[in-house]
């Protein structure tokens, strides 16, 4: 094992310099000290090393800092950030926005989305704020990373970031995340009116409550079926046929193609068939006429 060999006499380096390029891998393992590398990270980034040598340097740093790199080293990582894994980053404590932006610049175009996202999450966990500059520094990474943050991390994402979120970005978000993001979006778009408001908010409607959807139905928004399908079932089933008709406007006809799929199916099951029949779309699956529905979820009524 390379670790077992002793460093040859006269080979112990006191600084990071060009001589290290010519060390064999076992000599680097035996002779190089992690604290020296950490002190001279600028030179590690200046002098080119092979990927095998860089991997040994990383191993040395990991052994020197088993609890994660100190922020003083993280600030100096530069191009070496490319060799760090998301798992390594989760151990870090990063409080400086400049450090984050510098490392995001290094990661740009390097297939390092996972590391970039881990870095920002780690910064938020330490109480940092995700500002628009940082979102821009994240560049072309889809904002789906918002769904990877913990709900606590999401709290520190400013509402203004919601302007940058696109329709596909929230596809993999949990219900809890969608709820939080919807609240942020509401406050981000509070000064936008009419149809423009609906265009912006519709990306986030998967987090809307039944009350929010009712309010929206009063505004002739003509919601498309794709947006309707993204609404959470719990909110949707609370809407009446009349409310859904107002919400979808002329797009109500598209319910027919979705009647056997969730969430449309779930909504149909909760409507009276006679109300559905009035739509004249041939929708089936409602509560047969004359049946009474007891909702056992409303436990307070029985206590």
């Amino acid at each position: 094992d390379a670790e077992q060999k002793a460093c040859p006499p006269g080979k112990e380096p006191y600084k990071v310099d060009e001589d290290l390029i010519f060390y064999q891998n076992w000599e680097l393992e035996a002779c190089v000290d992690g604290t020296m590398l950490a002190r001279q990270m600028d030179l590690v980034n200046e002098i080119p090393f092979t990927y095998e040598q860089l991997s040994i340097f990383k191993h040395k740093l990991d052994k020197t800092y088993p609890q994660g790199y100190p922020e003083s080293l993280i600030q100096q990582l530069g191009h070496f950030f490319r060799y760090v894994s998301p798992e390594d980053i989760h151990q870090w404590n990063v409080t400086s926005p400049d450090t984050v932006k510098t490392l995001l610049k290094v990661s740009k175009g390097q297939k390092m989305n996972a590391q970039a996202i881990a870095l920002v999450a780690c910064y938020l966990r330490g109480g940092g704020q995700l500002d628009e500059d940082m979102v821009k520094a994240l560049g072309d990474i889809p904002l789906s990373y918002l769904c990877d943050f913990s709900p606590q991390d999401l709290h520190s994402v400013p509402s203004s970031v919601m302007w940058l979120v696109g329709p596909q970005d929230l596809d993999k978000c949990s219900q809890r995340h969608l709820g939080l993001l919807y609240q942020k979006a509401c406050s981000a778009f509070q000064n936008v009116s009419g149809l423009e408001y609906f265009e912006k908010i519709k990306t986030f409607l998967g987090g809307a409550s039944v009350k929010d959807l009712r309010a929206l139905s009063q505004h002739n928004v003509s919601m498309d079926i794709a947006t309707f399908k993204r609404l959470q079932v719990d909110s949707l089933v609370g809407l009446s046929v009349a409310e859904v008709q107002k919400l979808l406007g002329p797009n109500i006809v598209d319910l027919k193609t979705e009647e056997d799929k969730s969430p449309v199916r779930d909504w149909l099951f909760r409507q009276h068939q006679k109300d559905l029949d009035r739509l004249g779309l041939g929708l089936q699956g409602g509560i047969p006429n004359g049946y009474l529905v007891l909702d056992f979820n409303v436990r307070e009524a029985f206590s």
Epitope: E18, I21, N45, E46, P48, T50, L54, H79
Partner: nanobody, 117 residues
């Protein structure tokens, strides 16, 4: 797209000389490091000679110091390795490389050098 191509390898008797050339294309002047590496069968790749183009300083491994010389022709985008007093242990595939942002990022395919005793 940076491309590197080595030539000049071959078979030579111990004590003989060879000149290896490396043609670079798509190369930009922001890449400040050029080097020659070698790998013998069953051995790890090792650095042989390196040139820092910022000031044309050269660096060599102990095993080739005084026998090998690295140089470059900026106008022709060429890197050279002049090898003299060759030994059987110099036999290997020789690769040229360009270093950038703290790593040897671009590599040629290599050229075989065989030194017989």
């Amino acid at each position: 797209q940076v491309k590197l191509e080595e030539s000049g390898g071959g078979s030579v008797q111990a004590g003989g000389s060879l000149r290896l050339s490396c043609t670079t294309s798509g190369y930009t002047n922001s890449y400040k490091w050029m080097g020659w590496f070698r790998q013998a069968p069953g051995q790890e790749r090792e650095g042989v000679a390196v040139i820092y183009t910022g000031n044309d300083r050269t660096y060599y491994s102990d095993s080739v110091k005084g026998r090998f010389t690295i140089s470059r022709d900026n106008a022709k985008n060429m890197i050279y390795l002049d090898m003299t007093r060759l030994r059987p242990e110099d036999s290997a595939v020789y690769e040229c490389a360009i270093g950038h942002d703290g790593a040897w990022r671009y590599w040629g395919q290599g050229t075989q050098v065989t030194v017989s005793s």
